[in-house]
């Protein structure tokens, strides 16, 4: 019995279906086919879980969280024992193993391994201002998404016709910050933060209002 090499890893957007491949060759009839799919979740590597089981001509559910979402892609028994996972969740990310036994065929490689990564687009980022908005001050524009896999990068723009940040601004696209030094009236306006990763983008807008000093009456 020989389980075929599978692609190292599969990436899928959260909520979309994933197909985890596993095929094998055997010299025996498929009368005593026994297939166990296991997962070692990334979130809990010490706790492997059963995903689905085929034994004695019957299918059995694995861990409750997979109930109703998992099945074999083809009619069993077969030499293609790939499975699908519908409505993928972040917690489905992990290393999946198919363990195949087909007595009396023994020996050879009977395990196939596939990594599954569930990707999540950036959630609506939160835009905020840190620091005094008085003229001449330094301010930091902050942008962060609570969710996003891979980790989002952040691009700030000023929504004027140049789409450029003020000349005194420095941007950190990893941290999602823009530091604007010595703000002036020209720094005022609408700023856009675009959070993006491999599968999506999301934005927030921020309204920076630079406060000019009030003229004092000399009396």
């Amino acid at each position: 019995l020989e389980v075929s090499e599978s692609p190292g890893s599969i990436q899928v957007a959260r909520g979309q279906p994933a197909v985890l491949p596993c095929t094998f060759t055997t010299s025996a009839a498929l009368i005593n086919l026994n297939v166990i799919w296991m997962v070692t979740p990334l979130s809990n590597a010490n706790q492997p879980e059963q995903v689905i089981l085929y034994q004695g001509g019957q299918m059995f559910d694995g861990a409750p969280r997979f109930h109703g979402r998992v099945g074999f892609t083809g009619t069993m028994p077969a030499t293609n024992v790939s499975i699908f996972i519908n409505n993928t969740q972040l917690s489905d990310t992990g290393t999946y193993q198919c363990l195949v036994n087909n007595l009396p065929d023994i020996g050879g490689r009977n395990i196939g391994v596939t990594g599954l990564t569930v990707l999540v687009p950036p959630s609506a980022p939160h835009c905020q201002i840190q620091g005094s908005q008085d003229i001449g001050s330094d301010v930091i524009l902050l942008c962060s998404s609570e969710e996003g896999i891979p980790r989002p990068t952040y691009l700030w723009e000023k929504l004027d016709n140049t789409l450029k940040l003020p000349p005194t601004a420095t941007q950190d696209q990893v941290q999602g910050t823009v530091t604007i030094r010595n703000i002036s009236a020209l720094s005022s306006g609408l700023y856009q933060c675009v959070a993006s990763n491999a599968i999506g983008t999301s934005t927030c807008l921020l309204d920076l209002q630079v406060i000019s000093p009030q003229p004092r009456n000399i009396g």
Partner: antibody, heavy 123, light 110 residues
Framework: QVQLQESGPGLVKPSQTLSLTCTVS??????????WSWIRQHPGKGLEWIGY???????YYNPSLKSRVTISVDTSKNQFSLKLSSVTAADTAVYYC???????????????WGQGTLVTVSS | QSVLTQPPSASGTPGQRVTISCSGS????????VNWYQQLPGTAPKLLIS???NRPSGVPDRFSGSKSGTSASLAITGLQAEDEADYYC???????????FGGGTKLTVL
Amino acid sequence: QVQLQESGPGLVKPSQTLSLTCTVSGGSISSGGYYWSWIRQHPGKGLEWIGYIYYSGSTYYNPSLKSRVTISVDTSKNQFSLKLSSVTAADTAVYYCASWSLGTSNHGWFDPWGQGTLVTVSS
Amino acid sequence: QSVLTQPPSASGTPGQRVTISCSGSSSNIGSNTVNWYQQLPGTAPKLLISDNNNRPSGVPDRFSGSKSGTSASLAITGLQAEDEADYYCQSYDSNLSGWVFGGGTKLTVL
């Protein structure tokens, strides 16, 4: 409560420049946090954002119209204006001025709007 | 052609519940908030729903908004004759870096 009122010619010849003014009453155009916008509605069709101006004079235009649009502000008159050059029949529309503000939102909204003025481009 | 897609018309009888859909893409509705405007005959559009599901003061609670994925919808319960109007959805488009609208839905109260 802020109110907006558009004014300007209702008929413009092709290739000429469309000019409209929006007068703001019930509040100051120099109030921070408001972006004074122009939006148009072609006959029987949807709405199209044209651009905005901040009281400081900073402008931002719809990229599809950017080459022909100029928006300016006159804080002393509490007015802002739209100029659209090289007009064609496709620019025939009802033109609205509106105030956009971010509020506590991620993306803001337009409120209030002027009552709109129909501009026809025809020779 | 509008960036956001709405059905051109919808109708209902007084007291009925009517929904108006608004379909977009991942760069607008999919990742940003949606506003709805009501345009009564011969008047300017008026903000009806902001931030997907918030009603400004003065808007009856018969109007509600929702958003799922790249689509949004406006629901009107207990339809009344004065609800006959054009309804527009609007969002921000991250790719265009600008505000986009739907083509509008004309609601007729039968």
